[in-house]
Interface confidence: low
């Protein structure tokens, strides 16, 4: 029942064109190229894709034309290495194009960059958008994939044509509305926040395979997949862990024709069998491609099948189990975590995975024992410790959020993570602590048993954003381990983490608390990122302030920038006030 | 510019019959899920039906199922809604809306069910 058994095909670019249609065909293209090439203007983009796509027409028109039987790879990086300013914009990636294929794909893939040096994106006025929008409705929609994929070099191809459509249903909708802005900017927003929290998920999935391997990744499906269709087969949850991995390489691979389409065969097989997968899934096969795809990878968790036998009969109690364990470990381990978990949609992914290993550890462990019996006979109470670290934490953390609410909360974990990492950058412990703190008007309003796989789950994706931008520019060590020892235990390891007292403090520099009118003027979540700013810099001078100290210092600081925003001379204010201000948080901070 | 132009609407008896035209333009017709929507005197506007691009995919909400119909051409680019055994509580202007929105951008057709 493979979905991915196909013919071998002459033409491997005829065949993905065919599949996925022109349409398709160049939006990925241009994904492509955008995800590899970050800094290439947009007009040079449309320029490949366009050579690309007529080549490829050629090809569909006759397989057996020159080139056609080309390797997509050895196809789009051909066409990457002929871009003039390769050498002088990307430096060292240019060297890219002196080696071979597979090689020359992977020397790509490792020069994608999480932080690419580019402005942000600023939103015009409404009515530019839609007039650009109605002018040009096609290099509109382009410039938003080419845009979006170059900021987020692993965005997951397919998903960002869902996001694309939903962008121009947006357009087409409100440009037309009696109150265009009123109409438009919620879903911009909207579509921002989701896009984010996509590209940070799948940030995931792919550090998951290249850092960890298939055996990781494959593992955390199982995981998945079982709470979310608990009544489908082991085999059945298998057969859909491996073509999702299958998917999941592909386009953290960069082979996003090959991912598109395949994602696609797994949403048509998924529907044909829903039967037998889950009862949840009727709403989501109805929709056309792009939102069943999207639908199935969201939908709820289906009901618990009744009357489960108890998991101890097979995995403690049975006089097999480590003859079963010998026999087929990965099958065995693969069968126990799918068992677990879907008898805990209550778990996190992770905690499930924990268990999964602790598990593992005490089979190798008793296999080997003169009475392997005796000795795994009270592994089930090893977990017991496991699970009530997580509740406990997010029990203690939901009670501060819901005290302090958000943004102090998010204050609370920038002094917390900037005593745990001060080497870390100040824009990275502000970006990674305030998304730590979103964590609480997320998860916390569930009810317990949705708060885990919500709170902790969410946390290992925040989490992998400060290891891959660390992983750039490594700074600690600390985060080296945290990062690097093990997938799973990531969260806990920096939760682990004590004060740095080897950490020297940085030089007191007023330059960093000098503040100018142009505050008044952000919006709120940007002036929060300014105090945000100045708090962990003050940390970094200060690692050993108390709470209370810097409440203090940060209530001055709010108070002074209210006061200055109000002024009539605001800039004279903001000098004046501003040493003052300086003067007593020195004084204050014992600086 | 995207246009929606509804027309159909009129006065009616209780148990008779209207059928709504809303010819679209200025935009891909064929590539998008279009929807009826209702407003009546004094009340916010209600989603009535909608149908996805191909035309295959129909839905309705509880008051007019099993009573209206909704149907497209793509080809003339015309969205259509069939409404059988009317009822006065079906009285209220008519608006078809790209998608599944309930935000208006057309005058709509008025409908009256009243003996």
């Known amino acids: 029942r493979g979905v991915f058994r196909r013919d071998a095909h002459k033409s491997e670019v005829a065949h993905r064109f065919k599949d996925l249609g022109e349409e398709n065909f160049k939006a990925l293209v241009l994904i492509a190229f955008a995800q590899y090439l970050q800094q290439c203007p947009f007009e040079d983009h449309v320029k490949l894709v366009n050579e690309v796509t007529e080549f490829a027409k050629t090809c569909v028109a006759d397989e057996s034309a020159e080139n056609c039987d080309k390797s997509l790879h050895t196809l789009f990086g051909d066409k990457l290495c002929t871009v003039a300013t390769l050498r002088e914009t990307y430096g060292e990636m240019a060297d890219c194009c002196a080696k071979q294929e597979p090689e020359r794909n992977e020397c790509f893939l490792q020069h994608k960059d999480d932080n690419p040096n580019l402005p942000r994106l600023v939103r015009p006025e409404v009515d530019v958008m839609c007039t650009a929008f109605h002018d040009n409705e096609e290099t509109f929609l382009k410039k938003y994939l080419y845009e979006i994929a170059r900021r987020h070099p692993y965005f997951y191809a397919p998903e960002l044509l869902f996001f694309a459509k939903r962008y121009k249903a947006a357009f087409t909708e409100c440009c037309q509305a009696a109150d265009k802005a009123a109409c438009l900017l919620p879903k911009l927003d909207e579509l921002r926040d989701e896009g984010k929290a996509s590209s940070a998920k799948q940030r995931l999935k792919c550090a998951s395979l290249q850092k960890f391997g298939e055996r990781a990744f494959k593992a955390w499906a199982v995981a998945r997949l079982s709470q979310r269709f608990p009544k489908a087969e082991f085999a059945e949850v298998s057969k859909l862990v491996t073509d999702l991995t299958k998917v999941h390489t592909e386009c953290c691979h960069g082979d996003l024709l090959e991912c598109a389409d395949d994602r696609a065969d797994l949403a048509k097989y998924i529907c044909e069998n829903q039967d037998s997968i889950s009862s949840k899934l009727k709403e989501c096969c109805e929709k056309p491609l792009l939102e069943k795809s999207h639908c199935i990878a969201e939908v709820e968790n289906d009901e618990m099948p009744a009357d489960l036998p108890s998991l101890a009969a097979d995995f403690v109690e049975s006089k097999d189990v480590c003859k079963n364990y010998a026999e087929a470990k990965d099958v065995f381990l693969g069968m126990f975590l799918y068992e677990y978990a879907r008898r805990h949609p209550d778990y996190s992914v992770v905690l499930l995975l924990r268990l999964a290993k602790t598990y593992e550890t005490t089979l190798e462990k008793c296999c080997a024992a003169a009475d392997p019996h005796e000795c795994y006979a009270k592994v089930f109470d090893e977990f017991k410790p496991l699970v009530e670290e997580p509740q406990n934490l997010i029990k203690q953390n939901c009670e501060l959020f819901e005290q302090l609410g958000e943004y102090k909360f998010q204050n609370a974990l920038l002094v917390r993570y900037t005593k745990k990492v001060p080497q870390v950058s100040t824009p990275t412990l502000v970006e990674v602590s305030r998304n730590l703190g979103k964590v609480g008007s997320k998860c916390c309003k569930h009810p317990e048993a949705k708060r885990m796989p919500c709170a902790e789950d969410y946390l290992s994706v925040v989490l992998n954003q400060l290891c891959v931008l660390h992983e750039k520019t490594p700074v600690s060590d600390r985060v080296t381990k945290c990062c690097t020892e093990s997938l799973v235990n990531r969260r806990p390891c920096f939760s682990a983490l004590e004060v740095d007292e080897t950490y020297v403090p940085k030089e007191f520099n007023a330059e960093t608390f000098t503040f100018h009118a142009d505050i008044c003027t952000l919006s709120e979540k940007e002036r929060q990122i300014k105090k945000q700013t100045a708090l962990v810099e003050l940390v970094k001078h200060k690692p050993k302030a108390t709470k209370e100290q810097l409440k203090a210092v940060m209530d001055d600081f709010a108070a002074f920038v209210e006061k200055c925003c109000k002024a009539d001379d605001k800039e004279t204010c903001f000098a004046e006030e501003g040493k003052k201000l300086v003067a007593a948080s020195q004084a204050a901070l014992g600086l | 510019q995207v246009q929606l132009v509804e027309s159909g609407g009129g006065l009616v008896q209780p148990g008779g019959s209207l059928r709504l035209s809303c010819a679209a333009s200025g935009f891909t017709f064929g590539s998008f899920g279009m929807s009826w929507v209702r407003q009546a005197p004094g009340k916010g506007p209600e989603w009535v039906s909608a149908i996805d691009s191909g035309g295959a995919d129909t839905r309705y909400a509880e008051s007019v199922k099993g009573r209206f119909t909704i149907s497209r051409d793509n080809a003339k680019k015309t969205l259509y809604l069939q409404m059988n055994s009317l009822k006065p509580e079906d009285t209220a202007v008519y608006y078809c809306?790209?998608?599944?929105?309930?935000?208006?951008g057309s005058q709509g057709t008025q409908v009256t069910v009243s003996s």
């Open positions: 809306t790209i998608g599944q929105s309930t935000s208006r």
